[in-house]
Interface confidence: low
């Protein structure tokens, strides 16, 4: 399906509003430090050019690829070398190497200030004064902080952001209306970004076979009534969509995502009974709804898997004829029967099955060799079931904050070389699994928990890749995507680690502690906890609990004092001395 002008084709397919939004997202994800006004100027120039191509597809440069057009535009930025250093060298390359070069310079942890939320009246005034600029600023700020955010989904978030302001800026109590909506968008946005980052890591680090396997398992769970051929078609299309978005081809990605939504809605009968309510919605909402749709009911009469995959004498013949198709069918059949399993567990089972066939189909008596293959699955299934059970019990016993602290200690002991901010961020997010998953019924706990943990651990992996400090982390992150979580779970105290020297400065606190929000106070305390463990990796739970209780008491006391700063100056050294003694 070739077009004389790719840019005209995408402009016509997407419409001006979505075209401009996606180009802004693309540019903001590539040049994360550029000021907003610079990006708006570039987007306007590209849009005007696209319109000339719509009017005449034969016009000069209209036949160029989108990568060429966008790359040329990015390379006109005057301050490229001062702002981005070696990324400026990308501009000396030809496509497709230039785009690959830009992709490699995307920064998962850009040095950008945290977004501060202004007063509600200030935001409402800005929204009413210039709605278009206000929404563009939202796209820009999110995209530059989350360079792999799923672009068509970000347009959906922007639409919800707009709706929140349109509704709440009219309300009697603007803040009561708006703030919960903004909190929800922020939390959902962070989760969406992290989930997409795992998809991109899967594609970029492990290839499209890994992503396709993930998609077969997940879509088979969602659509257990769909036949294998239907699931395979959806997987192929979904892989194309995510490959494009992860590769920076945001216009193609959004266009193909819309086509996929259209196809699914036109073929509901052969996919799932749950799609109906999604398909009545407008495009952005429809695509989001389809992505989040609940699992359809399992067919009642599914036969045992053993007949085709263990008892049959044709297993090796069928495997040899088309390995990936046969394994794909196995994964489909297993996943559609197991909405209660995490996708990662299903992929481990498929891997184990593949390994057994590779070994047994070369043996003297293949059938005898693979007859007990399903028994080998048992420990693989028991391990995450038990992990979820134990951690949910711990969460219920401790509550979220103390559960996060338990994980902070656990992970700092495993990988003490990792930076303290990363350990705090990752452990806090790991700890959120409790509130997210432990309240669910048994059958939903494992898929919720393990697949969420995979997303959080991927964040650890992408941050660690930027500045590698631990061979253990590198090993767990790179050896096997599906075994990342078990690999981290299996890590023990790092005996080779040389404890960090005690630095009193790390444990010096000031009166500004008292004005922090509850969340910021927790982060401060958790930062101190990580530093304590790095200083004394063999400290017992009881010792650490004692120090943390003393810390909380010391902060509380000084925050109640008349002269807070004087209290911190006087009590701080006492706290440090007592802590050192307690940990000696």
């Amino acid at each position: 399906d070739t077009h004389k002008s790719e840019v005209a084709h995408r402009f016509k397919d997407l419409g001006e509003e979505h075209f401009k939004g996606l180009v802004l997202v693309a540019f903001s994800q590539y040049l994360q430090q550029c000021p907003f006004e610079e990006h708006v100027k570039l987007v306007n120039e590209v849009t005007e050019f696209a319109k000339t191509c719509v009017a005449d597809e034969s016009a000069e440069n209209c036949d160029k690829s989108l990568h060429t057009l966008f790359g040329d535009k990015l390379c006109t930025v005057a301050t490229l070398r001062e702002t981005y250093g070696e990324m400026a060298d990308c501009c000396a390359k030809q496509e497709p190497e230039r785009n690959e070069c830009f992709l490699q310079h995307k920064d998962d942890n850009p040095n950008l200030p945290p977004l501060v939320r202004p007063e509600v009246d200030v935001m409402c005034t800005a929204f009413h004064d210039n709605e278009a600029t206000f929404l563009k600023k939202y796209l820009y700020e999110v995209a530059r902080r989350h360079p792999y955010f799923y672009a068509p989904e970000l347009l959906f978030f922007a639409a919800r952001y707009k709706a929140a302001f349109a509704e709440c800026c009219q309300a009697a109590d603007k803040a009561a209306c708006l703030l919960p909506k903004l909190d929800e968008l922020r939390d959902e946005g962070k989760a969406s970004s992290a989930k997409q980052r795992l998809k991109c890591a899967s594609l970029q680090k492990f290839g499209d076979r890994a992503f396709k396997a993930w998609a077969v398992a997940r879509l088979s769970q969602k659509f257990p009534k769909a036949e294998f051929a239907e699931v395979s078609k959806l997987v192929t299309d979904l892989t194309k969509v995510h490959t494009e978005c992860c590769h920076g081809d945001l216009l193609e990605c959004a266009d193909d995502r819309a086509d996929l939504a259209k196809y699914m809605c036109e073929n509901q009968d052969s996919i799932s009974s749950k799609l109906k309510e999604c398909c009545d919605k407008p495009l952005l909402e429809k695509s989001h709804c389809l992505a989040e749709v609940e699992n359809d009911e399992m067919p009642a009469d599914l036969p045992s898997l053993a007949a085709d995959y263990v008892e049959s004498k044709d297993v090796c013949k069928n495997y040899a004829e088309a390995k990936d198709v046969f394994l794909g069918m196995f994964l489909y059949e297993y996943a559609r029967r197991h909405p209660d399993y995490s996708v990662m567990l299903l992929l481990r089972l498929a891997k184990a099955y593949e390994a057994t066939l590779e070994k047994c189909c070369a043996a003297a008596d293949p059938h005898e060799c693979y007859a007990k293959v399903f028994d080998e699955f048992q420990p693989l299934v028991e391990e995450p079931q038990n992990l979820v059970k134990q951690n949910c019990e711990l969460f219920e016993q401790l509550g979220e904050y103390k559960f996060q602290n338990a994980l902070l200690v656990r992970y700092t002991k495993k990988v003490p070389q990792v930076s303290t901010p990363t350990l705090v961020e990752v452990s806090r997010n790991l700890g959120k699994v409790g509130a997210k998953c432990c309240k669910l019924p048994e059958a939903k706990r494992m898929p919720c928990a393990e697949d969420y943990l995979s997303v959080v651990l991927n964040r650890l992996c992408v941050l660690h890749e930027k500045t590698p400090v631990s061979e253990k982390v590198t090993k767990c992150c790179t050896e096997s995507l599906v075994n990342r979580r078990p690999c981290f779970s299996a890590l023990e105290l790092d005996e080779a680690y040389v404890p960090k020297a005690f630095n009193a400065e790390t444990f010096t606190f000031h009166a500004d502690m008292c004005t922090l929000s509850e969340k910021e106070k927790q982060v401060k305390k958790q930062t101190a906890l990580v530093e304590l463990v790095k200083h004394k990796p063999k400290a017992t739970k009881e010792q650490l609990k004692g120090v943390m209780d003393n810390f909380a008491a010391f902060v509380e006391k000084c925050c109640k004092a008349d002269d807070k700063e004087a209290c911190f100056a006087e009590e701080g050294p006492k706290f440090v001395a007592a802590s050192q003694a307690a940990l000696a």
């Epitope: 029967r337 028994d375 028991e382 048994e442």
Partner: nanobody, 122 residues
Framework: EVQLLESGGGLVKPGGSLRLSCAAS????????MNWVRQAPGKGLEWVSS????????YYADSVKGRFTISRDNAKNSLYLQMNSLRAEDTAVYYC???????????????WGQGTMVTVSS
């Protein structure tokens, strides 16, 4: 022949106790996750409890947690369910079933007993 045979059901008053037994033949219970599943009159199957092959992992449905205890005697190749503080809503046919791969889904259990009736009534 591979089979399971339950016993121990009967009529009991609310608050009372019963111990169900399930004798296995043709295979060893310690090689499989074993389950108790029940079916109340006119209702669907409800999974009650499971014990993994290693015996390390034991699970209960929320409706019976704290009242029922699953156990296994490898020497006797048998599975048990100790039921205390029985309630009227525990009235059902109780089946023991073999789960070939700890799947936890009754529709994938491959070997079932014929069931034993438990009636809780005053």
């Amino acid at each position: 022949e591979v089979q399971l045979l339950e016993s121990g059901g009967g009529l009991v008053k609310p608050g009372g106790s019963l111990r169900l037994s399930c004798a296995a033949s043709g295979f060893t219970v310690s090689s499989y996750t074993m389950n108790w599943v029940r079916q109340a009159p006119g209702k669907g199957l409800e999974w009650v409890s499971s014990i993994s092959s290693s015996g390390r992992y034991i699970y209960y449905a929320d409706s019976v947690k704290g009242r029922f205890t699953i156990s296994r005697d490898n020497a006797k190749n048998s599975l048990y369910l100790q039921m205390n503080s029985l309630r009227a809503e525990d009235t059902a046919v109780y089946y023991c079933a073999r789960d070939p791969r700890m799947v936890g889904n009754p529709h994938e259990f491959d070997i079932w007993g014929q069931g034993t009736m438990v009636t809780v009534s005053s």
